[in-house]
């Protein structure tokens, strides 16, 4: 004879655990049904009656099978420097990520708590390390023979054009000016742009403890080869 399937609630065999999507209720001392994502427990089980579930109310959610008496509140609306990459539904929390040109200075379990504008490297400085979803741009001074004449979070230092006859020598923030009509370049002409970081939902972000006060973004800027004050400007 096949083993009889137990219907919830049921007393588990000694030493055994409840099945998938069930939980052991320590008061009833029974295996009882969990509620599905998007629901919560309205009435806990007894020895003879199973869990009664109800849908989460507006602006609340449960993401997992559960037996919580109340759904979780969705996070507050995304701020102006963020985009909503996942809406608040009965089964998932709202996720806010930083809009293009910004990076996440303070992350949370899913999405970002605090966005900060990507550093712009001022003339004479180029991008040494591009910004990512979670890290700021790092600027570096343009080495001899290279320059950057822009205030940009994407432009790197470019080589000076090589002149047959130099009218004005190049420096860190200006290209060389040639007198001849046919200058040559050591590299391909045109500004070199690094791609903007794209804000996407991180699948494996680690929870970050919330600070007691919102940190100043000036303390969140990574130190590059040169101090931020010398190689960057604020927006």
């Amino acid at each position: 004879l096949p083993a009889q399937v137990a219907f919830t609630p049921y007393a588990p065999e000694p030493g055994s655990t409840c099945r998938l999507r069930e939980y052991y209720d320590q008061t009833a001392q029974m295996c009882c049904s969990k509620c599905s994502p998007g629901q919560h427990a309205k009435v806990f089980c007894t020895k003879t009656s199973d869990t009664v579930c109800d849908s989460c109310e507006d602006s609340t959610y449960t993401q997992l099978w559960n037996w919580v008496p109340e759904c979780l509140s969705c996070g507050s609306r995304c701020s102006s420097d963020q985009v909503e990459t996942q809406a608040c539904t009965r089964e998932q929390n709202r996720i806010c990520t930083c809009r293009p040109g910004w990076y996440c200075a303070l992350s949370k379990q899913e999405g970002c708590r605090l966005c900060a504008p990507l550093r712009k490297c001022r003339p004479g400085f180029g991008v040494a390390r591009p910004g990512t979803e979670t890290s700021d741009v790092v600027c570096k001074p343009c080495a001899p023979g290279t320059f950057s004449n822009t205030t940009s979070s994407t432009d790197i230092c470019r080589p000076h054009q090589i002149c047959n006859v130099v009218a004005i020598p190049g420096n860190a923030s200006m290209d060389a000016v040639c007198t001849s009509t046919s200058p040559t370049r050591s590299m391909a002409p045109g500004a070199v742009h690094l791609p903007q970081p794209v804000s996407t939902r991180s699948q494996h972000t680690q929870p970050t403890p919330e600070p007691s006060t919102a940190p100043s973004t000036s303390f969140l800027l990574p130190m590059g080869p040169s101090p931020p004050a010398e190689g960057s400007t604020g927006d």
Partner: antibody
Framework: QVTLKESGPTLVKPTQTLTLTCTFS??????????VGWIRQPPGKALEWLAH???????YYNPALKSRLTITKDTSKNQVVLTMTNMDPVDTATYYC???????????WGQGTTVTVSS | DIQMTQSPSSLSASVGDRVTITCKAS??????IAWYQQKPGKVPKLLIH???TLQPGVPSRFSGSGSGSDYTLTISSLQPEDVATYYC????????FGGGTKVEIK
């Protein structure tokens, strides 16, 4: 409006059995998720949970007093009855009945009835 | 059985003070804790359930927090009408009350 009221003797002798009745209105013990429990409070002391009965007649007792307690319900009369055997002077207390929600906390309490155990 | 250790057993504070009462369970109670206020000669009144959910009509100066086995009731700004004894109730495994905290005004 939910109300509960306890009734029973104010004085019982040691070894006797105490019978208390909780009569309630504003809800029904035939409604899914509803329950009624009993709590007592000796003079100047803390609250102590005694027993509880659910809409489906499932019952729970304080393990330390289980052998002395019996809880029953009469759904048609909107009543819950608690009996406590072998009363002792240490059982002198105010006895409260309270409604319990489907998620197991007491939300509305009766006014309480004082029971003195003395010979 | 789960034991609930409530502290302090009594406290005296000035009007406007922040008052904190703690309850420690002998095991994890999964946030299943309620707080009651009992004024002298009166019936216990439910303030908070499921750790932090305020009952309708309860002033917002009352708040609850905690997880695992440690829970707190906070009165952010003590008022004269808050003079009472406060009890925690765990309902994670059967039901157990804490020993109570008597709150007085200095």
């Amino acid at each position: 409006q939910v109300t509960l009221k306890e009734s029973g003797p104010t004085l019982v002798k040691p070894t006797q059995t105490l019978t208390l009745t909780c009569t309630f209105s504003g809800f029904s013990l035939s409604t899914l998720g509803m329950g009624v429990g009993w709590i007592r409070q000796p003079p100047g002391k803390a609250l102590e949970w005694l027993a509880h009965i659910w809409w489906d007649a499932d019952k729970y007792y304080n393990p330390a007093l289980k052998s002395r307690l019996t809880i029953t319900k009469d759904t048609s009369k909107n009543q819950v009855v608690l009996t406590m055997t072998n009363m002792d002077p240490v059982d002198t207390a105010t006895y409260y009945c309270a409604r319990m929600t489907g998620t197991r906390y007491f939300d509305v309490w009766g006014q309480g009835t004082t029971v003195t155990v003395s010979s | 059985d789960i034991q609930m250790t409530q502290s302090p057993s009594s406290l005296s504070a000035s009007v406007g003070d922040r008052v904190t009462i703690t309850c420690k369970a002998s095991q994890n109670i999964n946030k299943f804790i309620a707080w009651y206020q009992q004024k002298p000669g009166k019936v216990p009144k439910l303030l908070i359930h499921y750790t932090s959910t305020l009952q309708p009509g309860v002033p917002s100066r009352f708040s609850g927090s905690g997880s695992g086995s440690d829970y707190t009731l906070t009165i952010s700004s003590l008022q004269p009408e808050d003079v009472a004894t406060y009890y925690c109730l765990q309902y994670g495994v059967l039901w157990t009350f804490g020993g109570g905290t008597k709150v007085e005004i200095k």
